[in-house]
C-alpha cells in the first residue's frame, strides 16, 4: 500500500487510509503497512487538540515551573492556561 495507507487483510487486495486520532485522543501506536493507527484517550494531565495519525497526548503545561499559576484548568482536549501570580501589596 501507498504511504499513509494500510492493507485491509492479509491478502492485501485493497488498502484503506490510516485513521487519525480525534482531539482528546492520542496515538498509542502509529499505523504500518498492515495495521491501522491505534488511538488512546488522553488521561488526566494530558491533552490533544488536533486530529492526527502521529501525535501522542501532550502533558499539560506546568505553570509552577514557570513561576505562574493555573488560570484555567486543562482538559483532555486543551492545555492549562497559565497566568501571573497575584502579588500581595
Amino acid at each position: 500500500c501507498e504511504e499513509g495507507w494500510h492493507c485491509t487483510s492479509e491478502a492485501c487486495e485493497s488498502c484503506v487510509l490510516h485513521r487519525s486520532c480525534s482531539p482528546g485522543f492520542g496515538v498509542k501506536q502509529i499505523a504500518t503497512g498492515v495495521s491501522d493507527t491505534i488511538c488512546e484517550p488522553c488521561p488526566v494531565g494530558f491533552f490533544s487538540n488536533v486530529s492526527s495519525a502521529f501525535e501522542k497526548c501532550h502533558p499539560w503545561t506546568s505553570c509552577e515551573t514557570k513561576d505562574l499559576v493555573v488560570q484555567q484548568a486543562g482538559t483532555n482536549k486543551t492545555d492549562v492556561v497559565c497566568g501571573p501570580q497575584d502579588r500581595l501589596r
Epitope: 504511504e3 499513509g4 487483510s9 487486495e13 485493497s14 487510509l17 485513521r19 487519525s20
Partner: antibody, heavy 115, light 112 residues
Framework: EVQLQQSGPELVKPGASVKMSCKAS????????IHWVKQKPGQGLEWIGY????????NYNEKFKGKATLTSDKSSSTAYMELRSLTSEDSAIYYC????????WGQGTTLTVSS | DIVMTQAAPSVIVTPGESVSISCRSS???????????FYWFLQRPGQSPQLLIS???NLASGVPDRFSGSGSGTAFTLRISRVEAEDVGIYYC?????????FGAGTKVELK
C-alpha cells in the same frame, strides 16, 4: 461478476431503529472494506463510514457516531448498517460500496421515516 | 473537514458540444506520497453513483475517452467533449485524502 445487493425499502416511525443489509458476491468478501453513503432526497452524498469484514474494524464519520452501527457477517458475505433513534432527517437513500473509489456500488436502500 | 465546492449547480449543454465542470477543495489534496486523492463520480437519473475518474485524470474502466480530468492541489476540472445523451446526470467530486471523505454538492448536466 462483483455485485452488491441491498435490502428493500423501509418505512419506519420516528424514534425506531432499522437495520439494512448489503450482500456481496463475485469476490472474496473479507478482502475489501464496505463503505456506506447517505443521499437525502434531491441532495448530495455523505460518507457514513466503513466496516472491514476481515477484522470487524469500523471507521465512522464523526457526524454519524451514535446514529449508525456498521457490522458484517463473513458466513453470508453480508454487511449491515443499523440506524437508531430515527427522525425525518434520516430519510434518504443509503448506498453500500466496495472500496468507495472502485466501481462497485449497491442499488441503494430507500429509508422513509414518517409517523 | 475538507469542504468540496462545486460552484455551478447545473449546466445546460447542446449535444455534441463540450462542457467543463469545476471543483475546489478547502485544502490541498496532494499527499506527501505524491498522489492527489481526488475523484469524479457520475450519478445518472435513478441510478447509483459510478466512478468516472480517479487521482485527477485516470479514467475508470469502461469510461469513454470523451471524459478527461485535470487540475492540481485545490482546483480541479472535468471536461466532457462531444456530450451525448447518456452523459446526463449529476457529477460529484470527492476527496479521499482525509476522514471523513467528503463530496461536492454536485453539478447537474442537462441537454438543451
Amino acid at each position: 461478476e462483483v455485485q452488491l445487493q441491498q435490502s428493500g425499502p423501509e418505512l419506519v416511525k420516528p424514534g425506531a431503529s432499522v437495520k439494512m443489509s448489503c450482500k456481496a458476491s463475485g469476490y472474496t468478501f473479507i478482502n475489501y472494506v464496505i463503505h456506506w453513503v447517505k443521499q437525502k432526497p434531491g441532495q448530495g452524498l455523505e460518507w457514513i463510514g466503513y466496516i472491514n469484514p476481515y477484522n470487524d474494524d469500523s471507521n465512522y464519520n464523526e457526524k454519524f457516531k451514535g446514529k449508525a452501527t456498521l457490522t458484517s457477517d463473513k458466513s453470508s458475505s453480508t454487511a449491515y448498517m443499523e440506524l437508531r433513534s430515527l427522525t425525518s432527517e434520516d430519510s434518504a437513500i443509503y448506498y453500500c460500496a466496495r472500496d468507495l473509489i472502485g466501481s462497485y456500488w449497491g442499488q441503494g436502500t430507500t429509508l422513509t421515516v414518517s409517523s | 473537514d475538507i469542504v468540496m465546492t462545486q460552484a455551478a449547480p447545473s449546466v445546460i449543454v447542446t449535444p455534441g458540444e463540450s462542457v467543463s465542470i469545476s471543483c475546489r477543495s478547502s485544502k490541498s489534496l496532494l499527499h506527501s506520497n505524491g498522489n492527489t486523492y481526488f475523484y469524479w463520480f457520475l450519478q445518472r437519473p435513478g441510478q447509483s453513483p459510478q466512478l468516472l475518474i480517479s487521482r485527477i485524470s485516470n479514467l475508470a474502466s469502461g469510461v469513454p475517452d470523451r471524459f478527461s480530468g485535470s487540475g492540481s492541489g485545490t482546483a480541479f476540472t472535468l471536461r466532457i467533449s462531444r456530450v451525448e445523451a447518456e452523459d446526463v446526470g449529476i457529477y460529484y467530486c470527492m476527496q479521499h485524502l482525509e476522514y471523513p471523505f467528503t463530496f461536492g454538492a454536485g453539478t447537474k448536466v442537462e441537454l438543451k
